[in-house]
């Protein structure tokens, strides 16, 4: 039950996270005009990964796309790439995790297959979240660098009568959406990986331990984990998993080196 809950919650958290990454990538407010020096501007500038916009007092907003690929800063291209990779990985992860969900039965899919798929999707979510966080952080760093550069320029070359206004940009809403979304996707991925551990069958599966009494042979078989009451004997103090959905009577007893004669 806890495994199903962890897996389900991981899926939902990742889903919200990836939706947030997509939203952040599409948003125009990655950087917004810094109003510290001029809080009464009649023209407000803001920029996204794909276009820059200007909002006038009337509410009229004009956006212009970056119709060049080669003319754009390498950092911006890198951020775009990181966000797209994050979205793609996240989308694939979501697709895989849907089939991995314990509450959804698809044919006769083994628990081991579901565990592998859960782990795969979890890793994908983690990488997706890291891509988003990295992309947003790179952009934020670029903003900070440009901010201080433009601040330095503001106080130089002002000897003449005419002043040129240097538009400074600060963090936009998309950065915070991106950070939160990346974090959620990362958390969701970790939850999926934790859930995978609960789904995976043990590598050494002690199906039965035979005790041979002198005179007549009696095999004592503790039930598999699904059927047992939890009081079965376990030589290594391990949980005993039953591979398939079989009844206790169908489990065969094999002699092993642990058999007591």
């Amino acid at each position: 039950m806890a495994v199903t809950a962890c897996q389900g919650l991981g899926f939902v958290v990742s889903l919200i996270g990836i939706a947030g990454i997509i939203a952040a990538t599409c948003m125009d407010q990655w950087s917004t005009q810094d109003l510290y020096n001029n809080p009464v501007t009649a023209v407000f500038n803001y920029q996204g990964l794909w276009r820059s916009c200007v909002r006038e007092s009337s509410g009229f907003t004009e956006c212009r796309g970056y119709f060049t690929l080669l003319g754009l800063p390498a950092m911006l291209q890198a951020v775009r790439a990181l966000m797209i990779v994050g979205i793609v990985l996240g989308a694939i992860g979501l697709l895989v995790s849907i089939f991995a969900l314990k509450c959804i039965r698809i044919g006769s899919m083994e628990d081991s297959a579901k565990a592998n798929m859960t782990l795969t999707s979890g890793i994908m979510f983690i990488v997706s979240g890291l891509c988003a966080i990295a992309g947003v952080s790179v952009f934020a760093n670029m903003l900070v660098t440009n901010f201080w550069m433009s601040t330095a320029n503001m106080y130089t070359g002002m000897g003449g009568m005419v002043q040129t206004v240097q538009t400074r940009y600060t963090f936009g809403a998309a950065l915070f959406v991106g950070w939160v979304a990346g974090g959620l996707t990362l958390i969701g991925g970790v939850m999926m990986c934790i859930a995978c551990r609960g789904l995976a069958p043990e590598e050494t599966n002690y199906k039965a331990v035979s005790y041979h009494a002198s005179g007549h042979s009696v095999a004592y078989k503790p039930g598999g984990f699904k059927a047992s009451t939890g009081f079965g004997s376990n030589t290594k103090n391990k949980k005993i998993y039953d591979g398939g959905a079989r009844t206790e009577d169908e489990v065969q007893s094999y002699p092993s080196k642990h058999d007591y004669v």
Epitope: Q33, N38, V40, T41, A42, V43, N45, Y46, Q47, S52, C53, V54, E56, S57, S58, G59, F60, E62, R64, V162, Q163, T164, V165, T167
Partner: antibody, heavy 119, light 113 residues
Framework: EVKLQESGGGLVKPGGSLKVSCAAS????????MHWVRQAPEKGLEWVAY????????YSTDTVKGRFTISRDSAKHTLFLQMTSLRSEDTAMYYC????????????WGQGTSVTVSS | DIVMTQSPSSLTVTAGERVTMSCKSS????????????LTWYQQKPGQPPKLLIY???TRESGVPDRFTGSGSGTDFTLTISSVQAEDLAVYFC?????????FGSGTKLEIK
């Protein structure tokens, strides 16, 4: 047809108060920001104040800050300018103007209302 | 605040003549975000309120005759009337629309001989 009609002007003593109004018609009043601009006799134009369409933002020139208040009643399609602590230099023709959708311009102007501050 | 300086303060021309008037701002009115200049031109005929002629430094308002042309960028702007008509007798004001408070130039009075 867009029409702006100012009213409420008149003669007032220094230190006195006056509230001028601007009745708007021919357009959706709540969709536009509105301005007050004044013109002293035989002088140039001076922008006084602005109120955004949502009524959330108001701006005014430093010379009237703390003395003049711009407001609007969208239900009545009316713009107001409450003037207090009036000075002789506030004597002017007061125009209300509609904020254009483009370029932060003022595309329609009223005929103006005259305000005289004199003892 | 942005200071707007207009020149000349007045000029007298004959009908059909080409006329240019200048407007300078103390600060650049060019917005980097959309590469538009936030300068507006108004015409005020005697006894009338001002009328919008040009916004964004060069975009004519609808209904304005095409003999009126705005040009310039940054801090230097010009209003040109290609062929002055008798009805163009007015005072022409430029206005900064980049940041509040909006400021107007002192005006250029156009007189017809």
């Amino acid at each position: 047809e867009v029409k702006l009609q100012e009213s409420g002007g008149g003669l007032v003593k220094p230190g006195g108060s006056l509230k001028v109004s601007c009745a708007a018609s021919g357009f959706t009043f709540s969709d536009y920001g509105m301005h007050w601009v004044r013109q002293a006799p035989e002088k140039g134009l001076e922008w006084v104040a602005y109120i955004s369409r949502g009524r959330s933002t108001t701006y005014s020139t430093d010379t009237v800050k703390g003395r003049f208040t711009i407001s609007r009643d969208s239900a009545k399609h009316t713009l107001f300018l409450q003037m207090t602590s009036l000075r002789s230099e506030d004597t002017a023709m007061y125009y209300c103007a509609r904020g254009s959708y483009y370029g932060n311009a003022m595309d329609y102007w009223g005929q103006g209302t005259s305000v005289t501050v004199s003892s | 605040d942005i200071v707007m300086t207009q020149s000349p303060s007045s000029l007298t021309v004959t009908a059909g003549e080409r006329v240019t008037m200048s407007c300078k701002s103390s600060q650049s009115l060019l917005n980097s975000g959309n590469q538009r200049n936030y300068l507006t031109w108004y015409q005020q005929k005697p006894g009338q309120p001002p009328k919008l002629l040009i916004y964004w430094a060069s975009t004519r308002e609808s209904g304005v005759p095409d003999r009126f042309t705005g040009s310039g960028s940054g801090t230097d702007f010009t209003l040109t009337i290609s062929s002055v008509q008798a009805e163009d007798l007015a005072v022409y004001f430029c206005q900064s629309a980049y940041s509040y408070p909006f400021t107007f130039g002192s005006g250029t009075k156009l007189e017809i001989k």
